[in-house]
């Protein structure tokens, strides 16, 4: 079992990258002198207790920043949030921490990230640039749920 996080960079099909702005992740076109975040990801160690056919359950964090992506309901709406959390603490927990887990599915070069806590809700960016990452159920044109994940070794 790999028990250190892997590092990766993410961009969407419009070549926008993830940038941290005021504790919020936004997707913006890549430019010079811009510092996209490096993603830290690690598979859930309790994979045998999660659904087998939805993808690889992973914790997603920002490398070196002690921030992890999580899903929580605000009112009736599942929302994507960044929480101060050590990804290895999540990994070592006695149970899957579903609010911080995403099913990572790959199809060719495209990756999707589906919330484990809210099945059917995916990490997405609006088709317009400069918008925060969100969770969506709408897999249509308004939002992009396909991302390119490049592992950094």
């Amino acid at each position: 079992k790999i028990d250190t996080p892997q590092r990766g960079s993410i961009q969407d099909i419009n070549h926008r990258v993830w940038v941290l702005q005021d504790q919020t992740l936004i997707a913006v076109p890549r430019k010079d002198r811009m510092s996209p975040v490096t993603i830290a990801l690690i598979s859930c160690r309790h994979v045998e207790t999660l659904e087998k056919d939805r993808g690889n359950p992973i914790y997603l964090g920002l490398n070196g920043l002690n921030l992890c992506l999580m899903c929580a309901k605000v009112g009736d709406q599942p929302t994507l949030q960044l929480k101060e959390k050590d990804i290895m603490d999540l990994y070592n927990q006695p149970e899957p921490v579903k609010s911080f887990l995403f099913y990572h599915s790959q199809s060719g070069r495209n990756s999707t990230f589906e919330s484990v806590a809210f099945p059917g809700w995916f990490i997405a960016v609006s088709s317009e640039g400069g918008c925060p990452l969100i969770l969506t159920q709408e897999l249509g044109k308004a939002n992009t749920t396909d991302f390119g994940l490049t592992m950094l070794f």
């Epitope: 999660l50 659904e51 927990q93 149970e95």
Partner: antibody
Framework: EVQLQQSGAELVKPGASVKLTCTAS????????IYWVKQRPAQGLEWIGR????????KFDPKFQGKATLTADTSSNTAYLQLSSLTSEDTAVYYC??????????????WGQGTTLTVSS | QAVVTQESALTTSPGETVTLTCRSS?????????ANWVQEKPDHLFTGLIG???NRPPGVPARFSGSLIGDKAALTITGAQTEDEAIYFC?????????FGGGTKLTVLG
Amino acid sequence: EVQLQQSGAELVKPGASVKLTCTASGFNIKDTYIYWVKQRPAQGLEWIGRIDPANAYTKFDPKFQGKATLTADTSSNTAYLQLSSLTSEDTAVYYCTRFHWYGSSFFFDYWGQGTTLTVSS
Amino acid sequence: QAVVTQESALTTSPGETVTLTCRSSTGAVTTSNYANWVQEKPDHLFTGLIGGTDNRPPGVPARFSGSLIGDKAALTITGAQTEDEAIYFCALWYSNLWVFGGGTKLTVLG
């Protein structure tokens, strides 16, 4: 108010099986894990295992594998512990407890009142 | 399988600070054991007090705190009250199962 209500005391013959019930109110069992714990007279607590009611996946202490079966019915917000091939060693109080994440950690926060099982001929 | 050991009984007085400990037969207790503490009062009334070594869930009085002291997990009651008379169990996580201690019977005189 969060509550776990367990079924009443059982007197069962050796070799038989029994199914204990834990009905939750004040929360949805799909949003948490349900653990089962055994307490024998004048002894400590023993972890039996757990169920994730959202997907029915279970985990057990190896010594209860084959002895205990855990199930859940999310429509009635109820978890079940079935014990088979009963012997006097199974005479105990059995508790269900919610194992819940609060943002920083998991806790055995709410417990049922326990079901007393007596195995005797 | 690991054995988890607690003091069998402790006595304190109202207002005093008392510390209960939890030892593992496999070596030092660490944060990776995610020590939990639960309280049992008469009539099988259990309440969770501490999770993840040192975290308190909502509704648990601030006089209860968890920590690691040396090679053991510890539950400290700062300013014990008569209603704290109970049996206290610790539970430690060992990668794939939970093991409970035998419990500490705490008497609060007065």
